[in-house]
């Protein structure tokens, strides 16, 4: 007769492992006991269990209620075993001993691996900006055994680049994700995607990117030069502008302080009923943790009683 | 009987390129991470490359863009494919098998790199 | 990466007597989830591939001599050879594979005296 076992069991993490060990013996030949042991315990194997055909199994103490033998119908030459809840220190060398008779002792070898599946982390790159150049926007690390497969998910254009270490059989696999920031990149979702084996689907993680931007700095509300006309009411500027993180606004007036009665409201500058005083230059300043841009405006009020046109001219700076 | 057997070696010029082959057999070739490891006439063991179960490679900086590694399980094969050979790539190149350490070699196969 | 240096560079002992290889490491390559070296010994005869003789340190390989043995932990280790036989001439590696680049030591030669 001969033993029929596996060269290699392979097991996730937490699940129960089957370690085989059949007898295929010619008829009439029976299984007395079947002994089994870690064989690369060091000095002497560690026993697992005895399976003996009268008395039942044994389980050490080491292994107790992790041993069982498979449930029902059962061979009566399978010295199969289950190994429940298998950990990563039970990956390893396993002997199973068969005492036969008339035909005396067999035993056989395998070899217990343990898929661990990976627990991925995303860590973002430094702050990005724009106008920087490749930047790297994120990197995810994953650790296995085996090495888990480690990719991105995103509408985002970029390059990847991966490294790996292996750790006797498990590995450590990190991909990082580099682009070149944009303010149209702002609110992208950036996903790490992890495949493995011991894994029933991916795991996923997103970040959200956060690109530094402030746009140009422009001011609306003089548009129609006619409506700025001693006491007209209402009048207002808007200083408009778009960034991330969103920006602050400050009003000053180039030739002196602002007016009194003008009103400052964020983004907006609030006027009375207009009079010639509240001619001047205005200046939008607007800023972030980014930059800063200004925008200045002359504002030229118009008295009906003097017969001359109002002039309005527009600059912007940076 | 475990086995691995070596093949591919030979005389190549410098800058020229090998294709290394190693053929297994006798166990479960796709559940073992594989390797490359050479030795130069008279020297040490020099770990080349490594391939996992589900095809990641690692390189030393010496080989890294030089020498590829690749498995085909349903061959039982390991292929080691070297391009831009110097003489300093002159060795026995072993196949070996990673269980706890290097637990089955090959015989080796001699690369020569010589004009 | 990882250097390992094996002293001494060669080594003559009498037959029957105890020969010792020292491995030292340029970093631990004890693995603290399990408590193993990721540390194994090679020995090779002239003409032959290496045999794997220890792994994990102190774990000797099935079918290896119990006269062959391995200590030591963290970044220094140690093989012994309890009482040379003629057949244990050959050269002597260690090698760690804790993490990639794999690297061996030097090796060490042992002759008879």
């Known amino acids: 007769g001969e033993l029929e076992t596996s060269d290699v069991v392979t097991v996730v993490l937490g699940q129960d492992a089957k370690l085989p060990c059949f007898y295929r013996g010619d008829s009439g030949e029976q299984v007395g006991q079947v002994a089994w042991a870690r064989a690369d315990a060091g000095e002497g194997a560690q026993e697992l269990a005895l399976l003996h055909s009268k008395y039942g199994l044994h389980v050490s103490p080491a292994y107790e209620g992790r041993v069982e033998q498979p449930p029902p119908p059962r061979n009566p030459l399978d010295g199969s075993v289950l190994l429940r809840n298998a950990v990563q220190a039970d990956e390893g060398e396993y002997e199973c001993r068969v005492s036969t008779f008339p035909a005396g002792s067999f035993q056989a070898r395998l070899r217990l691996r343990v898929l661990v599946p990976p627990l991925p982390s995303l860590n973002p790159g430094p702050a990005l900006e724009e106008g920087q150049g490749l930047t790297l926007a994120a990197s995810c690390t994953a650790e296995g055994s085996p090495a888990p497969s480690v990719t991105w998910d995103t509408e985002v254009k970029g390059t990847t680049s991966s490294r790996s270490f292996k750790h006797s059989r498990s590995a450590a696999v990190t991909s990082e994700f580099h682009l070149v920031p944009s303010r149209s990149m702002n609110g992208q979702p950036l996903t790490c995607v992890v495949s493995h084996p011991g894994l029933l689907q991916d795991q996923r993680i997103t970040h959200i990117l956060h690109v530094s931007f402030l746009a140009e700095a422009s001011v609306r509300g003089l548009e129609d030069q006619n409506l700025w006309h001693v006491g007209r009411e209402g009048a207002m500027l808007k200083c408009l502008s778009e960034g991330q993180p969103p920006p602050s606004y400050n009003w000053t007036r180039l030739d002196g302080p602002l007016p009194s009665g003008v009103r400052v409201d964020g983004d907006t500058l609030g006027f009375p009923p207009l009079t010639t005083e509240h001619s001047g230059i205005y200046v939008c300043h607007v800023s972030n943790e980014f930059s800063s841009r200004d925008s200045q405006v002359t504002v030229d009020v118009l008295d009906p009683q003097e017969d001359s046109g109002k002039q309005v001219d527009l600059v912007s700076a940076s | 009987e475990v086995q691995l057997v070596e093949s591919g070696g030979g005389l190549v010029q410098p800058g020229g390129s090998l294709r290394l082959s190693c053929a297994a057999s006798g166990f479960t070739f796709s559940s073992y991470d594989m390797h490359w490891v050479r030795q130069a006439t008279g020297k040490g063991l020099e770990w080349v490359s490594a391939i996992g179960t589900v095809g990641d490679t690692y390189y030393p900086g010496s080989v890294k863009g030089r020498f590829t590694i690749s498995r085909e399980n349903a061959k039982n094969s390991l292929y080691l494919q070297m391009n831009s050979l110097r003489a300093g790539d002159t060795a026995v190149y072993y196949c070996a098998r990673e269980w706890n350490g290097m637990d089955v070699w090959g015989q080796g196969t001699t690369v020569t790199v010589s004009s | 990466d990882i250097v390992m240096t094996q002293s001494p560079d060669s080594l003559a002992v009498s037959l029957g007597e105890r020969a010792t290889i020292n491995c030292k490491s340029s970093q631990s390559v004890l693995y603290n989830s399990n408590n193993k070296n990721y540390l194994a010994w090679y020995q090779q005869k002239p003409g032959q591939p290496p045999k794997l003789l220890i792994y994990?340190?102190?774990t000797r390989e099935s079918g290896v001599p119990d006269r062959f043995s391995g200590s030591g932990s963290g970044t220094d280790f140690t093989l012994t050879i309890s009482s040379l036989q003629a057949e244990d001439v050959a050269v002597y590696y260690c090698q760690q594979f804790y993490t990639t680049p794999y690297s061996f030591g030097q090796g060490t030669k042992v002759e008879i005296k």
């Open positions: 994990w340190a102190s």
